[in-house]
Amino acid sequence: KIDTPQRGSIQDINHRVWVLQDQTLIAVPRKDRMSPVTIALISCRHVETLEKDRGNPIYLGLNGLNLCLMCAKVGDQPTLQLKEKDIMDLYNQPEPVKSFLFYHSQSGRNSTFESVAFPGWFIAVSSEGGCPLILTQELGKANTTDFGLTMLF
């Protein structure tokens, strides 16, 4: 079997979707004639070398766009970035590429995405909306870290 990424769509609990704007992912309320991104995701093939019970380690990209989500420090602050990268190139690497990996945890219909490189930091959107996706340590009211992931088959 040849492993291939799965495709999915994401929205948060406020029904905002992810859209690409100037090479940045932002969360906005869904409207007509809007084209939300389709997510590409694939599990890390070296799962046995990563932490157990934190979720399923996945690479997360934008389907058909050769862009993947990664975490990098800017100064002392972990930040979420989009990098030009083929998700299958990451998948095939001989070691987990931690900066591009996220622990995907599901609780009911809610999904969270925790950075493998920066444990305790989660993909989030500001509760205000219309803002770029960020990484946060604060799982409170200011940021939303719970997302609905619908797989597309």
Epitope: T49, L50, E51, N92, Q93, P94, E95, K98
Partner: antibody, heavy 121, light 109 residues
Framework: QVQLVQSGAEVKKPGASVKVSCKAS????????IYWVRQAPGQGLEWIGR????????RYDPKFQGKATLTTDTSTNTAYLELSSLRSEDTAVYYC??????????????WGQGTLVTVSS | QAVVTQEPSLTVSPGGTVTLTCRSS?????????ANWVQEKPGQLFTGLIG???DRAPGVPARFSGSLLGGKAALTLSGAQPEDEADYFC?????????FGGGTKLTVL
């Protein structure tokens, strides 16, 4: 600057154990993978295994499973290789190396100076 | 376990081109073997040259290039310099473990 400094040469008797250290500076070992490699006199390189210092998971070449144990102390930014039940065939220079992802691939970008372990009765 | 074989020694003239190869006992080397090349100069630390078959490590001169050639991993040195005289080792990935070759002693003469 980035450096890996290994402990000094050791002379051990057959059946004994030895622990070699590899102290990193200029980077945090939790941000990368530390590999261990050996070179016996007049021979090529042999991969022993690797450790992910952030979570402690290891991989070993099947030949070294049970012979080598890799650990780290992240508080001192140091990686360790322990070899047990030493035999004369374990006489070699042991190297630690950083295996790091940069741009699009993993590279062995920095190496320690090597530690000579001599096993002799 | 796989055996990785390199030319024991090669000689190149200053300014010349030489190709070092890395053969796998299991068959053709592919991009899935993620060939790495490292250099050892006398009295100096090892240096990583190539990762992922053909990606030069940061700071490595452009005269070094990695490729696949006739079912083997290859390291080509174009415009050899006296300071390139060294031992060169390749390493190939096989699933979850890494196997090094015996090394090639390159003389620039």
């Amino acid at each position: 600057q980035v450096q890996l400094v290994q402990s000094g040469a050791e002379v051990k008797k057959p059946g004994a154990s030895v622990k070699v250290s590899c102290k990193a500076s200029g980077f945090n070992i939790k941000d990368t993978y530390i590999y261990w490699v050996r070179q016996a006199p007049g021979q090529g390189l042999e991969w022993i295994g690797r450790i992910d210092p952030a979570i402690g998971t290891t991989r070993y070449d099947p030949k070294f499973q049970g012979k080598a144990t890799l650990t780290t102390d992240t508080s001192t930014n140091t990686a360790y290789l322990e070899l047990s039940s030493l035999r004369s065939e374990d006489t070699a220079v042991y190297y630690c190396a950083r295996y790091d992802y940069s741009g699009s691939s993993f590279y062995f970008d920095y190496w320690g100076q090597g530690t000579l372990v001599t096993v002799s009765s | 376990q796989a055996v990785v074989t390199q030319e024991p020694s090669l000689t190149v003239s200053p300014g010349g081109t030489v190709t070092l190869t890395c053969r796998s006992s299991t068959g053709a080397v592919t991009t899935s073997n993620y060939a790495n090349w490292v250099q050892e100069k006398p009295g100096q630390l090892f240096t990583g040259l190539i990762g992922g078959t053909n990606d030069r490590a940061p700071g490595v001169p452009a005269r070094f290039s990695g490729s696949l050639l006739g079912g083997k991993a290859a390291l080509t040195l174009s415009g050899a310099q006296p300071e390139d005289e060294a031992d060169y080792f390749c390493a190939l990935w096989y699933s979850n473990h890494l196997v090094f070759g015996g090394g090639t002693k390159l003389t620039v003469l």
